[in-house]
């Protein structure tokens, strides 16, 4: 038997307009930097790729997703030290033999010039100047992202 | 006097970081259901556990973290079909030989009665009635969560 709260929440959710997304971030939280319509968190500590993904997720954010070369360059401009690497949300899918973003889309080969191998247990990091394939177990920094403003009419694809 | 939820919320609530709070969801987005102070998204499609974690992350949410038996029961009440399994944010840490939430806290052994083995590549799913250990590569549905409102002065021990 469903409680009254549970019953209500189902009905309410079904009656709401699909454009009523989360209110969205109006400003970036402390420690996060704004880059266009995103808030980015550049970690100081280090983690393997999986832990980095989990950390962003528990912060209700995503490992960085990069749309194109332009966004890559702007992100790299925020990295102060040449020697530092940061995980992003891209790893090698063995079953699909391709680089895959954590949102399920494949890498457009023109977007990033990756240094290193495309093979099992490879994940992608960025530095101030380059994009590297690294073993996913390597402990390096990571970048989380939050969307700064709600994108109207964005419907989360059926998960 | 603290409610049972407040009393039992120690580790799980300490997953997020108080300095990374968005202004908070006032209402749950379309397709998400409200359960107390959370918004839950029950997927319709299926995925291995890792992909489910990634999917929640790209939705700026987390695989479900369950505070206590009470929250488990209320979540299970929202599952309509007895035969369906859903991944939650709990898997077996081989290095630590323990069940570990994706926020880094260990499972309180009293919270969930798990059917199945605690071993490498085991992840936790819930059904309408039970909690199961499954191979993480199994493709089943999953549950994402977003905090509905920021709870001020909450100490989040993780980005």
């Amino acid at each position: 038997q469903k409680s009254s709260i549970e019953k209500c929440s189902v009905d309410i959710q079904q009656s709401r307009n699909k454009t009523t997304e989360r209110p969205g971030l109006l400003n970036c939280p402390i420690y996060w930097q704004q880059l266009r319509e995103k808030c980015l968190l550049f970690s100081h500590t280090v983690n393997p790729w999986n832990n980095s993904l989990a950390d962003c997720s528990t912060k209700e954010s995503s490992l960085l997703l990069i749309r194109d070369k332009d966004e890559l360059i702007h992100t790299q401009n925020l990295i102060r030290d040449k020697a530092i690497l940061f995980w992003i949300g891209l790893n090698f899918s063995l079953s699909e033999k391709n680089w895959k973003w954590i949102n399920g889309s494949f890498l457009n080969s023109n977007d990033l010039e990756i240094r290193g191998d495309a093979k099992e247990n490879s994940c992608i990091s960025i530095s101030q100047t380059s994009v590297y394939s690294e073993y996913c177990s390597t402990e390096i920094r990571w970048i989380c992202q939050k969307e700064l403003t709600p994108v109207r009419n964005k419907v989360y694809p059926d998960s | 006097q603290k409610s049972s939820i407040e009393k039992c919320s120690v580790d799980i609530q300490q997953s997020r970081n108080k300095t990374t709070e968005r202004p908070g969801l006032l209402n749950c987005p379309i397709y998400w259901q409200q359960l107390r102070e959370k918004c839950l998204l029950f997927s319709h499609t299926v995925n291995p556990w890792n992909n489910s974690l990634a999917d929640c992350s790209t939705k700026e949410s987390s695989l479900l973290l369950i505070r206590d038996k009470d929250e488990l029961i209320h979540t299970q009440n929202l599952i309509r079909d007895k035969a369906i399994l859903f991944w939650i944010g709990l898997n077996f840490s081989l290095s630590e030989k323990n069940w570990k939430w994706i926020n880094g806290s260990f499972l309180n052994s009293n919270d969930l009665e798990i059917r199945g083995d605690a071993k490498e590549n085991s992840c936790i799913s819930i059904s309408q009635t039970s909690v199961y250990s499954e191979y993480c590569s199994t493709e089943i549905r999953w549950i994402c969560q977003k905090e509905l409102t920021p709870v001020r002065n909450k100490v989040y021990p993780d980005s």
Epitope: T45, D55 | P157
Partner: antibody
Framework: EVQLLESGGGLVQPGGSLRLSCAAS????????MSWVRQAPGKGLEWVSA????????YYADSVKGRFTISRDNSKNTLYLQMNSLRAEDTAVYYC??????????????WGRGTLVTVSS | DIQLTQSPSSVSASVGDRVTITCRAS??????LAWYQQKPGKAPKLLIY???SLQDGVPSRFSGSGSGTDFTLTISSLQPEDFATYYC?????????FGGGTKVEIK
């Protein structure tokens, strides 16, 4: 209860060794980098060492490099500091400390009570 | 290593006074500066992080400001429980470094 509790301090002769422990509770220990910070009697605070959450990455102050080793056992929620070749100038209260955010090394929002290490002949 | 220079090293003040402590970094650290309060025989307590963010439970009479190399901790109206030593700390790069401390004493 969210807390850190150090142990293992005591009196040791110069050149000797000591192992400090810090038991953590009430928070997701393995997601945080952890540090040791010390304070000599009547002096200021000095950061000693830090370790990543997974434990594979460590850093040391120059003053202890090669002599001290930081480690952690996440299954026991415990942080350690192995101190070898101790010198008189290592005499201090040693604190373990947790950062405010899992993405940081510092901004310590939780400290232990400290354990006193005295190096003297 | 980044050096942090605190001034003054000690200050005598009365209850109700406004007290200002400064911390200067040897190189730019953006907003990566924290302030701690320490009382004799006790562990330090975080007051301010990221230059100006007040830690939970810390009275609003404490405030922080600054960025780059120059930072300030202000106690707007000194209370009896505020007599203690205050330290700044940078979290920009490893090694983590602390200022030498400022002792706030009763006049």
């Amino acid at each position: 209860e969210v807390q850190l509790l150090e142990s293992g301090g005591g009196l040791v002769q110069p050149g000797g060794s000591l192992r400090l422990s810090c038991a953590a509770s009430g928070f997701a220990f393995s997601t945080y980098a952890m540090s040791w910070v010390r304070q000599a009697p009547g002096k200021g605070l000095e950061w000693v060492s830090a370790i990543s959450g997974v434990g594979g990455t460590t850093y040391y102050a120059d003053s202890v490099k090669g002599r001290f080793t930081i480690s952690r056992d996440n299954s026991k929620n415990t942080l350690y500091l192995q101190m070898n070749s101790l010198r008189a100038e290592d005499t201090a209260v040693y604190y373990c400390a947790k950062p405010l955010d899992s993405s940081l090394w510092a901004d310590f929002d939780l400290w232990g009570r400290g354990t006193l290490v005295t190096v003297s002949s | 290593d980044i050096q942090l220079t605190q001034s003054p090293s000690s200050v005598s003040a009365s209850v109700g006074d406004r007290v200002t402590i400064t911390c200067r970094a040897s190189q730019g650290i953006s907003s990566w500066l924290a302030w701690y309060q320490q009382k004799p025989g006790k562990a330090p307590k975080l007051l301010i992080y990221y230059a100006s963010s007040l830690q939970d439970g810390v009275p609003s009479r404490f405030s922080g400001s600054g960025s780059g190399t120059d930072f300030t901790l202000t106690i707007s109206s000194l209370q009896p429980e505020d007599f203690a030593t205050y330290y700044c700390q940078q979290a920009s790069v490893l090694p983590i470094t602390f200022g030498g401390g400022t002792k706030v004493e009763i006049k």
